[in-house]
């Protein structure tokens, strides 16, 4: 189960994101910062700092619009 305000690294980070985002999927950097996705992003924010549910959800992809 997800525990708020903790660091999440490794496989645990991937598994937690899959749980939080569900069918939406996710990306490891927010769309606005794709240029620097390898120098910032969720690994830095959640693994080396700390992260909560609200922050995790900002990395969930936007669901595709159904026609």
């Amino acid at each position: 189960a997800y525990r708020p305000s903790e660091t999440l690294c490794g496989g645990e980070l991937v598994d937690t994101l899959q749980f939080v985002c569900g069918d939406r999927g996710f990306y490891f950097s927010r769309p606005a910062s794709r240029v620097s996705r390898r120098s910032r992003g969720i690994v830095e924010e959640c693994c080396f700092r700390s992260c909560d549910l609200a922050l995790l959800e900002t990395y969930c992809a936007t669901p595709a619009k159904s026609e």
Epitope: G10, R38, V43
Partner: antibody, heavy 126, light 107 residues
Amino acid sequence: EVQLLESGGGLVQPGGSLRLSCAASGFTFSEYEMSWVRQAPGKGLEWVSSIYSSGGWTKYTDSVKGRFTISRDNSKNTLYLQMNSLRAEDTAVYYCAKGVHYDSSGLPIDWYFDLWGRGTLVTVSS
Amino acid sequence: DIQMTQSPSTLSASVGDRVTITCRASQSISSWLAWYQQKPGKAPKLLIYKASSLESGVPSRFSGSGSGTEFTLTISSLQPDDFATYYCQQYNSYPWTFGQGTKVEIK
């Protein structure tokens, strides 16, 4: 050639200090988390420390917290381990290792160590 | 911390034997497990990652399986080059931890 090469090991007295270096080549060093893993003589592997790709964030195993400092210089493709207040139980071969792996779109998806250096021996003894 | 326990500690086998090494985690690590081979005086070499994915260049006689807390490394037909020590490692969460190792020696 993709490789890691450690240096800086040697004999040091208890309480002393040593600085290890790991020179990386053949890959974009600045994009990868790097780690130190050690192995005491005749013993198994023990993860020591990791540092984020940009260098700003670090992790340590409990037994070295406050004594060891991991750092990196991405302009020199080099990883460091500053070891202070050394103890006999720190005697080991120290390996640097490359971790965090990206998929084709640049997303970090895995954290195993796919590249290791040959190691440098640190002996703490009076 | 997640404890990793390997069995057996030592395994005596002959060339051509099928060899199985077990690794158990103290809590679930999903499939976030790697296997390494180490020979005396050498650095570890990655064999398997994500429990069952074979690293590029590693012979197909090596295979990994398992998920959750129990994992196995299998060598389908032991070759002279395979006598070494094998370690499992979890990377589900920090601190990364290794099993104590399994030495595969000549019978």
